[in-house]
Structure formats: structure tokens, C-alpha cells
């Protein structure tokens, strides 16, 4: 599996480095984490564990987006 | 209404190059990726590029790499196909498409160009 | 690569007529299937996608079934406007791949 890799990028531009996922069962995880008045973070990976899960803060929220498609 | 038109076809020696357009329109150009697509005279469907919506990453079959290049100006909603050291299996319709989304991991090729004809010979 | 093998190849049958193509893969590809009809001289146009879903303003006698490495597009009454090629298509994985198309005639 073919995902897009980074660590706290604020632009998804910055976010097209390419990992290949060998373990199996693995997937493509995307972190979406904005604080309030301030960008939104983005982080990709492969991820073993992924679970689709949103969730809202006092000062911000945070959402995570699992797939399992080239380049997804 | 949603649309993709192709130019730049044309006959062309084996070796040679050419670069193929692709202008968008009713859409929001920047926020997709793109892809060419091109079907032989044989009838078959081949996927020979894609690009990411910025134009940061891109990706082709190895029948392809370091051929063809894919790029795109978002300012001016247009897709490219620069097309080198072309062969005659080269010889093809070439349709410029849109990828959709379903869900996260889910996309097909939702809209296409009518095409453009290239003819190495 | 994954290998998408379609059959048949041409088929030919009468108007009202059910319709099915196969299309299997080398490989497991989940429900990462999509369908497309091409008529002669235009762009393709997708018509199924994610094996089963039907695209918007597509008429509800085509449908789609399978998972894992089998599945079947189905036209369940044929009619003269439906002479074209068919293709399904994979995008579990890199390099996308087609099959190599089902031309369909009338009797």
C-alpha cells in the first residue's frame, strides 16, 4: 500500500512524500488537528491501527481519516 | 457544466515529442487530481499518468516513467501531457479525466475529455 | 501489476435480452471496482462504481455485483442504445488497470 507521509504540515503540499506500507492490514492515516484562530496541522501516514474518529475541543478539534488505496 | 476539452494530438515520427492540453471548466480545477488515459487502437483502456490537485506529486506506469511528464496550471485550469522518445505502441486516444472520490478510499474517473488523437509513424 | 481478465471478449444478443460480463483480478481488490461504457467515437462514461453504485442519470436496467476477485455487470434488459464496449477497472492499486472490454451488438 502506497500512502502519502509527513509530520505536522500545514499545507497538504507539504504532505506528498510516499511511504510504502508493508505490514499487513495496514493503512493510510490522515490527522487533521486545528486549533481555534490558528491552521489546521496535517500529518499522513501507514498506520496498523487506524479508526475513523472526529472529535471537538474547547480549543480546537481534531479528525482522523483512514483509507486503503494507493495514494488514497 | 462540467467539462474537459483535449488538444495537442497530431502524427509524429517515432522518437519524437509532443505535448497534449487539457483546459477545465465547471469545476474547481485545483481542488482534483488528474489523470490521462488512453485507448489504443486495439480497444484497450491504459491509465499513463496522474497528478496530485497542487501538481506536487506525481505518478506513472513504468511502461511510462521517464517518457511522458504530467503537469498543470491550476491559474489556468489546464492539464499536460508532455509526451517524449515517443514508439509507435505509443499510438493512441488520449482522454484527459477527473477523480472522484466515494467515501475515503473509494474513486473512480467520473468525468472525461472527448480526446485527442496521436499517431506515431 | 494487477491483472483484470474480462469475458467475453463480444457478445451479441437481442434486444430485451439479459446481459452479464465477468471480470476477475490476479489479485484481492475489495469492492475497488468501477465500470465504464464506451460508445463508438465517444469518451468512455462511467456507469458503475465501488462494484455496485450506480452513477447519477444511469438508467437502473445496468448494475453491478462481486467482491474479493469476481464480479459481474449486468444489463438486465438490453436495448439499442447500449451497443458499445464495456470496461471494468480496478483502483485498489497501483498502476490502475482496465480490463480489456466487453463489445456489445444486437442480433
Known amino acids: 500500500l502506497l500512502c502519502y507521509s509527513c509530520k505536522a504540515q500545514v499545507s497538504n503540499e507539504d504532505c506528498l512524500q510516499v511511504e510504502n506500507c508493508t505490514q499487513l492490514g495496514e493503512q493510510c492515516w490522515t490527522a487533521r488537528i486545528r486549533a481555534v484562530g490558528l491552521l489546521t496541522v496535517i500529518s499522513k501516514g501507514c498506520s496498523l491501527n487506524c479508526v475513523d474518529d472526529s472529535q471537538d475541543y474547547y480549543v480546537g478539534k481534531k479528525n482522523i481519516t483512514c483509507c486503503d488505496t494507493d495514494l488514497c | 457544466q462540467v467539462k474537459l476539452q483535449e488538444s495537442g494530438g497530431g502524427l509524429v515520427q517515432p522518437g519524437g515529442s509532443l505535448k497534449l492540453s487539457c483546459v477545465a471548466s465547471g469545476f474547481t480545477f485545483s481542488s482534483y487530481t488528474m489523470s490521462w488515459v488512453r485507448r489504443t487502437p486495439e480497444k484497450r483502456l491504459e491509465w499513463v499518468a496522474y497528478i496530485h490537485n497542487g501538481g506536487g506529486h506525481t505518478y506513472y506506469p513504468d511502461t511510462i516513467k521517464g517518457r511522458f511528464t504530467i503537469s498543470r496550471d491550476n491559474a489556468k485550469n489546464t492539464l499536460f501531457l508532455e509526451m517524449s522518445s515517443l514508439k509507435s505502441e505509443d499510438t493512441a486516444m488520449y482522454y484527459c479525466?477527473?477523480?472522484?472520490?466515494?467515501?475515503?478510499?473509494?474513486?473512480?474517473?467520473?468525468?472525461w475529455g472527448a480526446g485527442t488523437s496521436v499517431t506515431v509513424s | 501489476d494487477i491483472q483484470m481478465t474480462q469475458s467475453p471478449s463480444s457478445l451479441s444478443a437481442s434486444v430485451g435480452d439479459r446481459v452479464t460480463i465477468t471480470c476477475r483480478t490476479s489479485?484481492?481488490?475489495?469492492?475497488?471496482l468501477n465500470w465504464y461504457q464506451q460508445k463508438p467515437g465517444k469518451a468512455p462514461k462511467l456507469l458503475i462504481y465501488?462494484?455496485?453504485k450506480l452513477n447519477s442519470g444511469v438508467p437502473s436496467r445496468f448494475s453491478g455485483s462481486g467482491s474479493g476477485t469476481d464480479f459481474t455487470f449486468t444489463i438486465s434488459s438490453l436495448q439499442p442504445e447500449d451497443i458499445a464496449t464495456y470496461y471494468c477497472q480496478q483502483s485498489k492499486t497501483l498502476p490502475w488497470t482496465f480490463g480489456g472490454g466487453t463489445k456489445v451488438e444486437i442480433k
Open positions: 489479485q484481492d481488490i475489495s469492492n475497488y
Open positions: 479525466t477527473r477523480r472522484m472520490y466515494y467515501g475515503n478510499s473509494h474513486w473512480y474517473f467520473d468525468v
Open positions: 465501488y462494484t455496485l
